[in-house]
């Protein structure tokens, strides 16, 4: 079953995928595709690496991490609802049927509508305007805008989002991570 990751319309989505090269410089080709991993290759390829470089990509998709050390996590820029779905990260290990395949489910949520300003209450200490959505590598941030009048429902929503962020971080070392060699 797929691990689920969430992002908001207009933000950057982050889909983690890692491997450990057998030895420094022993990189293996990786492909990312939209749709579940097929038997071979990736369907609807959005990005591909060879043993050295990124050698194919489509706009809005890139590897922000140190892919030459095995961080082949995919960043999707400025997501829309159409970006929802299953993505395949395939570590193309040499040999017959040696590939490691990971299916990651991306759920895109509609952008929050900033409520009309009412009497200002100071929640900035408890709820800073920028929430870091992952703890590994360059921080992706979610802009929450001004929070003038937060009720209990909104606090609950924020808590859920923070929980989702922590879950994504926790999954880094358990989900799409393999050691080669």
């Amino acid at each position: 079953s797929e691990v689920e990751y969430r992002a908001e319309v207009g933000q950057n989505a982050y889909l983690p995928c890692f491997y450990t090269p057998a030895a420094p410089g022993n990189l293996v080709p990786v492909c990312w595709g939209k749709g579940a991993c097929p038997v071979f290759e990736c369907g609807n390829v959005v990005l591909r690496t060879d043993e050295r470089d990124v050698n194919y990509w489509t706009s809005r998709y890139w590897l922000n991490g140190d892919f030459r050390k095995g961080d082949v996590s995919l960043t999707i820029e400025n997501v829309t609802l159409a970006d929802s779905g299953i993505y395949c990260c395939r570590i193309q290990i040499p040999g017959i049927m040696n590939d490691e395949k990971f299916n990651l489910k991306l759920v895109i949520k509609p952008a929050k509508v900033t409520p009309a300003p009412t009497r200002q209450r100071d929640f900035t200490a408890a709820f800073p305007r920028m929430l870091t959505t992952r703890g590994h590598g360059p921080a992706e941030t979610q802009t929450l805008g001004s929070l003038p009048d937060i009720n209990l429902t909104q606090i609950s929503t924020l808590a859920n989002e923070l929980r989702d962020s922590r879950l994504a971080n926790d999954l880094r070392d358990s989900g799409a991570t393999i050691r080669i060699g």
Partner: antibody, heavy 120, light 107 residues
Framework: QVQLVQSGAEVKKPGASVKVSCKAS????????MDWVRQAPGQGLEWLGY????????SYNQKFKGRVTMTTDKSTSTAYMELRSLRSDDTAVYYC?????????????WGQGTTVTVSS | SIVMTQTPKFMPVSAGDRVTMTCKAS??????VAWYQQKPGQSPKLLIY???NRYTGVPDRFTGSGSGTDFTFTISSVQVEDLAVYFC?????????FGTGTKLEIK
């Protein structure tokens, strides 16, 4: 010490081919990639491609695909770059350069350059 | 392919000046940017790789920074021997591409 020594200057007519050699010493030839870069007179740098001597794997800049071939001779630690169907805008200094994983495949040692002039 | 837009093209300097040049990638390249120095009649020399890593033997007056699409190369105190052309290069994707160069000239 690491050295990359390239072959001498060449003058060619349009439509001809040129083959530039690059003899490596001072390191294990098969442990590093060999990239080829050119520089037209007074211009910037343009990457043509690379070859990995260990397995003869190559990657070429699409702009030169079909015209460029990179090869190596492991017994003499020499890399070769052949460019065919030469045009006047291929007039440039051609460099071989070593690249390796330790520097994220940037080019840490360069040959002295080979001037190729294409003129009728 | 990724376009590397380097500015400025020319930079008049005096010894001791602090100089900064920039390179902007047409799409994110992570930290995969290098900087090279080329003196007249010579081959390029690697100074910085992976955005901020100084290559072996390169004086610490040369520094690089940036990530994503925006990168900066700084010489903290220019010496006469630093007069040269400086190129940025993205080493993220194939084909690798270079900036057009920044030439340091005497004021």
């Amino acid at each position: 010490q690491v050295q990359l020594v390239q072959s001498g200057a060449e003058v060619k007519k349009p439509g001809a081919s040129v083959k530039v050699s690059c003899k490596a010493s001072g390191y294990t030839f098969t442990d590093y990639y060999m990239d080829w870069v050119r520089q037209a007179p007074g211009q910037g740098l343009e990457w043509l491609g690379y070859i990995y001597p260990n397995n003869a794997g190559t990657s070429y800049n699409q702009k030169f695909k079909g015209r460029v071939t990179m090869t190596t001779d492991k017994s003499t630690s020499t890399a070769y770059m052949e460019l065919r169907s030469l045009r006047s805008d291929d007039t440039a200094v051609y460099y071989c350069a070593r690249s390796g994983y330790g520097n994220y495949y940037t080019m840490d040692y360069w040959g002295q350059g080979t001037t190729v002039t294409v003129s009728s | 392919s990724i376009v590397m837009t380097q500015t400025p093209k020319f930079m008049p300097v005096s010894a001791g000046d602090r100089v900064t040049m920039t390179c902007k990638a047409s799409q994110s390249v992570g930290n995969n940017v290098a900087w090279y120095q080329q003196k007249p009649g010579q081959s390029p020399k690697l100074l910085i790789y992976y955005a901020s890593n100084r290559y072996t033997g390169v004086p610490d007056r040369f520094t690089g920074s940036g990530s994503g699409t925006d990168f900066t190369f700084t010489i903290s105190s220019v010496q006469v021997e630093d007069l040269a052309v400086y190129f940025c290069q993205q080493h993220y994707s194939s084909p690798s591409t270079f900036g057009t160069g920044t030439k340091l000239e005497i004021k």
